[in-house]
C-alpha cells in the first residue's frame, strides 16, 4: 500500500530551485543535529517562528482551517538505488522527504538488512522549514568502508503511528577477494590422495582461484571459487597455498604445510623409576609421533648376564600414560630394557639399550628334604635339608629360619632358631618328652624369609625307649608323617 | 636449531645468566645440556636438564650453576663467576637419557644437536 | 669421577690416507657401548660422529668407523679428506654417575 501511495504521490514542491542542491539563502536549514550515540527523532519546527527552533517536543498545532485541503500521501523522495564503491573509500547517501507543517513528532531512523542502526554511525539530519512543509534530508556517511558496510539501507518515518519507508539503497563495497575457506595443513600418508579446498568471495565477482605448490602454480588455467584441489599423492612434505582474484587484484592464502606420514622416532628418555624383586616400573618420553598417533609402545627386556639365552621378552601396552610395570622378572638379575613405540605407520626404532636390576627378594622356595630324627643320647633333635635352587633363592642366602612346635597333652609352645647360611643341618634341644615335635625350615636373604617347608612331626617318647628311626619331608600327596619310637 | 645468549665481559662474582632458546623441537620432549670451552682447551660437561625438569651436575659444577627452563628456553646461571670461568658455552640437545629415579642420578646417550656458543670472559 | 684418555695428538696423515684414534676409559662405561665421538672445526660447535661405539650419526659419511667396548674405544678415518682436519671427542657415561666425560681431545692435521 505504501509502495502505491508513493508511485502516485506528486512531492509537495520544498521550494525554487534545484533540490538539494544550492539552496537559497533564505532556506538555509534552522538545525542539524548529528547523531553521535544513537538515533534521536529527528526534530519538526513551527514555521511560525523561523528561525527559532524549539528545544525539546515541539507541539505543531493542528490545522483546524474549514478550507484546508486533503493532504497527500508522504513518500521519500527518489534517490540513487545503487552504490558501487572500493573498500576503505568513504561514502555519503541520504534520504529526503518533505512532510507538511501539520504533521507533529516525527522521527527518522536508518535500517540495514532489516536491522535498525543504532550506535555510533554518522548520521545527520537537517531540518528546512517552509510555509506549508519542512523538507528533511537524513545523511548517512562512513567515513572508510569495510565489507561488512555491504548492504541494504533504508529510512523510516513514523508519523501518527504510520510508518513510511524509502526506497533501498544498495552498497556494495568491492575489494580483493576475501577468503571463506582456506586450505588446511594435513598429515597424509605417502603417495595417498588428498583434498584441499580454496573459497574466496567478492564484490566484485567472479572470484578465480590458482593453487600454487612450493611456490609454483598448480594449474595454468583457473577455477572459478570454490576451488578443490585433489593432489594425487605426496612422496616428502609440501607448502600448498591458494591465489583468489578479481577484477581489484589478488589476494593469497596462507601457505599450509602437508606433512608425510613416517615411523615415529624412538624414545629420547627412558626413566628407571622403581625396582623391586620382580620388577621394574619404567617411564618414557616419546620422540617425534611421525606426524601420526602414537598407538601403543613395546618394552624389550632381556637378561644382560652374558651367558644367559639372549632371549628378549617383550611387554606391549598402551602409549599412554607412558608408564609400564615389567612384572615376572627375577630377583637380583640384570636386565637391558628398550623401548619402541608404534603409530599407523610402524615400529620406531628401538631407544638405545638401558640397565636396570632387581633388588633381593624372599626366597620363593623351601628347602627340599628337610629330614628330621631323635638322637638320644645327647637329648637333641637333628635336622638335615638342601639348600633351595639358587634360582629360586631370590637373593643372595644369609641362612635359615626354623621353627620347631612341641605339642602334648594340652600344652603348645613354638621356638624360632637362626641357623647360618654355610650349614644344611642343625640340632635342637629336646623340649618335652612324652610329646610331638613338628618342625619347618624357611631360607632367608636379605630379602626376606621364604615360605616355610611342609612340616615333619616326630615324636619324642618318654625316658627309656630305644628304638629311633628318622622322620622326614612326605612325598607328595601323603598325610604328614609321624613316627612314634 | 639451538642458540645460545647472553655471553659478555663480567666481573668476578658478578652473577650472569646464559639462554639457549630452541626452535624445531620441544623442551619438554628432550632433555637439554650445558657444555662449555676454555680458550683452546677442550670441552667440559656442565649439567643437564631432564624433559621433566630434574637437574643433574657435574661434581665439580655443582653449586657453582643453576640450570632451570621454560618451554622454549633453558638457562644456565653462573651464581658467582670467577676468571677460571672464560670460557664459549654451548647448548647442546640431548639424544637419549636414561634417568634412575630412584637413586637421584642419570646418563647421556649422546649429545646430537649444538649450538654455536656464546663466549663469556670473566675479568676484573 | 671416571676420566677418559684420548691418544695421540696431534696425529696427521696424508690426503686418502687412514688415522685411528684411541680413546681409554678408567672404568666401563654405560652398558658398555654408550660412548660417543665429536668432531670439532675451529671457531664452530662440535658435532655428533658416531654414538653406540659405533652407530654413525645422519649424515655422517661411511668413511667414519668406531669400534670397541668397555673400557677401550677407537675411530678410524679412512680416506682422509683436508675437510677431515679438525679436532675429535671421545664422550661417555658411566653407570651410578651423571657425570658425561669428554676425552681430551685429538688434533687430526690432513698433509
Known amino acids: 500500500a505504501i509502495t502505491e501511495a508513493r508511485e502516485e504521490a506528486k512531492p509537495y514542491p520544498l521550494f525554487p530551485g534545484p533540490f538539494p542542491g544550492s539552496l537559497q539563502t533564505d532556506h538555509t536549514p534552522l538545525l542539524s543535529l548529528p547523531h553521535a550515540s544513537g538515533y534521536q527523532p529527528a526534530l519538526m519546527f513551527s514555521p511560525t517562528q523561523p528561525g527559532r527552533p524549539h528545544t525539546g517536543n515541539v507541539a505543531i498545532p493542528q490545522v483546524t482551517s474549514v478550507e484546508s485541503k486533503p493532504l497527500p500521501p508522504l513518500a521519500f523522495k527518489h534517490t540513487v538505488g545503487h552504490i558501487i564503491l572500493s573498500e576503505h573509500k568513504g561514502v555519503k547517501f541520504n534520504c529526503s522527504i518533505s512532510v507538511p507543517n501539520i504533521y507533529q513528532d516525527t522521527t527518522i531512523s536508518w535500517w540495514k538488512d532489516g536491522k535498525e542502526l543504532l550506535g555510533a554511525h554518522h548520521a545527520i539530519t537537517q531540518f528546512y522549514p517552509d510555509d506549508e512543509v519542512t523538507a528533511i534530508i537524513a545523511s548517512f556517511s562512513i567515513t572508510s568502508v569495510q565489507r561488512s558496510d555491504n548492504g541494504s539501507y533504508i529510512c523510516k518515518m513514523k508519523i501518527n503511528n504510520e510508518e513510511i519507508v524509502s526506497d533501498p539503497i544498495y552498497i556494495e563495497v568491492q575489494g580483493l577477494p576475501h577468503f571463506t575457506k582456506q586450505p588446511e595443513s594435513m598429515n597424509v600418508t605417502r603417495n595417498t590422495a588428498f583434498n584441499l579446498t580454496c573459497q574466496a568471495v567478492g564484490p566484485p565477482e567472479p572470484v578465480n582461484i590458482f593453487w600454487v605448490q612450493n611456490s609454483s602454480r598448480v594449474n595454468e588455467q583457473p577455477e572459478k571459487s570454490p576451488s578443490v584441489l585433489t593432489v594425487p599423492g605426496l612422496t616428502e612434505m609440501a607448502v600448498f597455498s591458494c591465489e583468489a582474484h578479481n577484477d581489484k587484484g589478488l589476494t593469497v592464502s596462507k601457505g599450509v604445510q602437508i606433512n608425510i606420514k613416517a615411523i615415529p622416532s624412538p624414545p629420547t628418555e627412558v626413566s628407571i623409576r622403581n625396582s623391586t624383586a620382580h620388577s621394574i616400573l619404567i617411564s618414557w618420553v616419546p620422540g617425534f609421533d611421525g606426524y601420526s598417533p602414537f598407538r601403543n609402545c613395546s618394552i624389550q627386556v632381556k637378561e644382560a648376564d652374558p651367558l644367559s639365552n639372549g632371549s628378549v621378552m617383550i611387554f606391549n601396552t598402551s602409549a599412554l600414560p607412558h608408564l609400564y610395570q615389567i612384572k615376572q622378572l627375577q630377583a637380583l638379575a640384570n636386565y637391558s630394557i628398550g623401548v619402541s613405540c608404534m603409530n599407523e605407520i610402524g615400529w620406531s626404532a628401538v631407544s638405545p639399550w638401558i640397565l636396570a636390576s632387581t633388588t633381593e627378594g624372599a626366597p620363593s622356595v623351601a628347602p627340599l628334604n628337610v629330614t628330621v630324627f631323635l638322637n638320644e643320647s645327647s637329648d637333641n633333635v637333628d635336622i638335615r635339608w638342601m639348600k633351595p635352587p639358587t634360582k629360586q633363592q631370590d637373593g643372595e642366602l644369609v641362612g635359615y629360619r626354623i621353627s620347631h612346635v612341641w605339642q602334648s597333652a594340652g600344652i603348645s609352645k613354638e621356638l624360632l632358631e637362626e641357623v647360618g647360611q654355610n650349614g644344611s643341618r642343625a640340632r635342637i634341644s629336646v623340649q618335652v618328652h612324652n610329646a610331638t615335635c613338628t618342625v619347618r625350615i624357611a631360607a632367608v636373604t636379605r630379602g626376606g624369609v621364604g615360605p616355610f617347608s611342609d612340616p615333619v612331626k616326630i615324636f619324642i617318647p618318654a625316658h627309656g625307649w630305644v628304638d629311633y628311626a628318622p622322620s622326614s619331608t612326605p612325598a607328595p600327596g601323603n598325610a604328614d608323617p609321624v613316627l612314634i619310637i | 636449531s639451538v642458540e645460545e645468549s647472553g655471553g659478555r665481559l663480567v666481573t668476578p662474582g658478578t652473577p650472569l645468566t646464559l639462554t639457549c632458546t630452541v626452535s624445531?623441537?620441544?623442551?619438554?620432549?628432550?632433555?637439554m645440556s650445558w657444555v662449555r670451552q676454555a680458550p683452546g682447551k677442550g670441552l667440559e660437561w656442565i649439567g643437564i636438564?631432564?624433559?621433566?625438569?630434574s637437574t643433574y651436575s657435574a661434581s665439580w659444577a655443582k653449586g657453582r650453576f643453576t640450570i632451570s627452563k621454560t618451554s622454549t628456553t633453558m638457562d644456565l646461571k653462573i651464581t658467582s663467576p670467577t676468571t677460571e670461568d672464560t670460557a664459549t658455552y654451548f647448548c647442546?640437545?640431548?639424544?637419549?637419557?636414561?634417568?634412575?629415579?630412584?637413586?637421584?642420578?642419570?646418563?647421556?646417550?649422546?649429545?646430537?644437536?649444538w649450538g654455536q656458543g656464546t663466549l663469556v670472559t670473566v675479568s676484573s | 669421577a671416571a676420566v677418559l684418555t684420548q691418544t695421540p695428538s696431534p696425529v696427521s696423515a696424508a690426503v686418502g690416507g687412514t688415522v685411528s684414534i684411541s680413546c681409554q676409559s678408567s672404568?666401563?662405561?654405560?652398558?658398555?657401548?654408550?660412548l660417543s665421538w665429536y668432531q670439532q672445526k675451529p671457531g664452530q660447535p662440535p658435532k655428533l660422529l658416531i654414538y653406540?661405539?659405533?652407530d654413525l650419526a645422519s649424515g655422517v659419511p661411511s668413511r667414519f668407523e668406531g669400534s670397541g667396548s668397555g673400557t677401550e674405544f677407537t675411530l678410524t678415518i679412512s680416506d682422509l679428506e683436508c675437510d677431515d682436519a679438525a679436532t675429535y671427542y671421545c664422550?661417555?657415561?658411566?653407570?651410578?654417575?651423571?657425570?658425561?666425560?669428554f676425552g681430551g681431545g685429538t688434533e687430526v692435521v690432513v698433509k
Open positions: 647442546a640437545r640431548v639424544g637419549f637419557f636414561v634417568g634412575y629415579g630412584a637413586y637421584d642420578y642419570g646418563i647421556i646417550h649422546r649429545l646430537d644437536l
Open positions: 664422550a661417555g657415561g658411566y653407570s651410578g654417575d651423571s657425570d658425561y666425560a
Open positions: 624445531g623441537f620441544s623442551l619438554s620432549s628432550n632433555a
Open positions: 636438564i631432564s624433559s621433566s625438569g
Open positions: 653406540d661405539a659405533s
Open positions: 672404568k666401563s662405561i654405560y652398558n658398555n657401548n654408550w
